[in-house]
């Protein structure tokens, strides 16, 4: 029989973007395995990632059932092979993760500019409505479907020939901005949830400039 060296998991961290949600922890296992359990505050503890030697567990399938719920998670450590556990009185070692509220805590993924179209001195910029893993009636919802008017986009735009940026905001996925005729502009967007205190903003989208593929121009 081996030494008593089963250790509890630590540094439990939620990694979540656009509701794709993974729980990570340490240490890399030596003579032990892990099982993760997830629960809502009022619900069952459901086991996932059984007897795994990984130090992460994808919990997306569970949290997308109700993204406005509060979730609890814990990681159990079990001895591998003939190693005795350090748990007292036969109780397994486990560590609790901090509570996780997907609607509040998931990070906003980097948005993408889907297209822009110039008509005279107006440009219509459309942001791609990214699909999430949240389902309703067997279809995947978009970010806009989930967040509704809580989600806004900020557009940064500037003349290709200068560095002075202007901004516009929308609570849809479209911007209609005024531009100077004959000038080329560059665009970048950012997703924002103003009501949040943390994880309020996404990273900026890749820059798209007029005169490149995504644009259409009509006089």
């Amino acid at each position: 029989s081996g030494t008593t060296n089963t250790v509890a998991a630590y540094n439990l961290t939620w990694k979540s973007t656009n509701f794709k949600t993974i729980l990570e922890w340490e240490p890399k296992p030596v003579n032990q395995v892990y099982t993760v359990q997830i629960s809502t505050k009022s619900g069952d503890w459901k086991s996932k990632c059984f007897y795994t030697t990984d130090t992460e567990c994808d919990l997306t399938d569970e949290i997308v059932k109700d993204v406005k719920q509060t979730y609890l998670a814990r990681v159990f450590s079990y001895p591998a092979g003939n190693v005795e556990s350090t748990g007292s009185a036969g109780e397994p070692l486990f560590t609790n993760a901090r509570k996780f509220l997907p609607y509040r805590d998931t990070k906003l993924g980097q948005p993408t500019i889907q297209s822009f179209e110039q008509v005279g001195t107006k440009v219509n910029v459309t942001v791609e409505d990214e699909r999430t893993l949240v389902r309703r009636n067997n279809t995947f919802l978009s970010l806009r479907d989930v967040f509704g008017k809580d989600l806004i986009y900020t557009l940064y735009y500037w003349k290709s020939s200068s560095s002075g940026k202007k901004t516009a905001k929308t609570n849809t996925n479209e911007f209609l901005i005024d531009v100077d005729k004959g000038e080329n502009y560059c665009f970048s967007v950012q997703a924002v949830i103003p009501s949040r205190t943390v994880n309020r903003k996404s990273t900026d989208s890749p820059v798209e400039c007029m005169g490149q593929e995504k644009g259409e121009f009509r006089e």
């Epitope: 395995v33 099982t35 069952d44 503890w45 459901k46 086991s47 059984f50 007897y51 591998a80 092979g81």
Partner: antibody, heavy 121, light 107 residues
């Protein structure tokens, strides 16, 4: 087709060891956990432990800790269960059983035919 | 360890009868419960996984449901070939544990 074929019946003396084999075929051996479950005559089912064939990692029920060893040979897609310090109450049919797919990871969807181990002086 | 209390331990019913077996977990196990059928001299066979999902190829007269820590296994219309012992098994907590079994016989 998917199947698990176990080694034949064994008769052992108390204090001895027994090693039962379970050969898998018809599926990717490394992709599914393998479990061992035993059944004493006229009794119910008792889970002994699990082996992950891809890495050889094992987890045992505490009751068998220190007496059981599960191993695997990936070249022959075979798992082994060795039980030592045998006593009369270890007389049972020993089954290997495949853990199901990701959807039912710890449901035993394929079973071996069983190996009768008799411990008698 | 989680105790799985299965009842009744045996029952006798007529062909065509509705048969119900229950399994009670000693604590919350979510829907992490499977049901098996074992015929005399044979290995068990998976019928239901995750409390209510029918394994591929299993006749639809078999079903499972859950209410809290109580799990129910039902044969809607008993057939002669259903003579067997039925076991529940939980996998939400280590170690995995089985119920004591229910022997089903024909009247």
């Amino acid at each position: 087709q998917v199947q698990l074929v176990q080694s034949g019946a064994e008769v052992k003396k108390p204090g001895a060891s027994v090693k039962v084999s379970c050969k898998a075929s018809g599926y990717t051996f490394a992709n599914y956990y393998m479990h061992w479950v035993r059944q004493a005559p006229g009794q119910g089912l008792e889970w002994m432990g699990i082996i992950n064939p891809s890495g050889g990692i094992t987890v045992y029920a505490q009751k068998f800790q220190g007496r059981v060893t599960m191993t695997r040979d990936t070249s022959t897609s075979t798992v082994y269960m060795e039980l030592s310090s045998l006593r009369s109450e270890d007389t049972a049919v020993y089954y290997c059983a495949r853990g199901g797919s990701k959807v039912a990871a710890l449901a035993f969807d394929i079973w071996g035919q069983g190996t009768m181990v008799t411990v008698s002086s | 360890d989680i105790q799985m209390t299965q009842s009744p331990s045996s029952l006798s019913a007529s062909v065509g009868d509705r048969v119900t077996i229950t399994c009670q977990a000693s604590q919350d196990i979510s829907n992490s419960l499977n049901w098996y059928q074992q015929k005399p001299g044979k290995a068990p066979k998976l019928l239901i996984y995750d409390a209510s999902n029918l394994e591929t190829g299993v006749p639809s007269r078999f079903s499972g449901s859950r209410s809290g820590t109580d799990f129910t296994f039902t044969i809607s219309s008993l057939q002669p070939e259903d003579i067997a012992t039925y076991y529940c098994q939980q996998y939400n907590f280590h170690p995995l544990t089985f119920g004591g079994g229910t022997k089903v016989e024909i009247k």
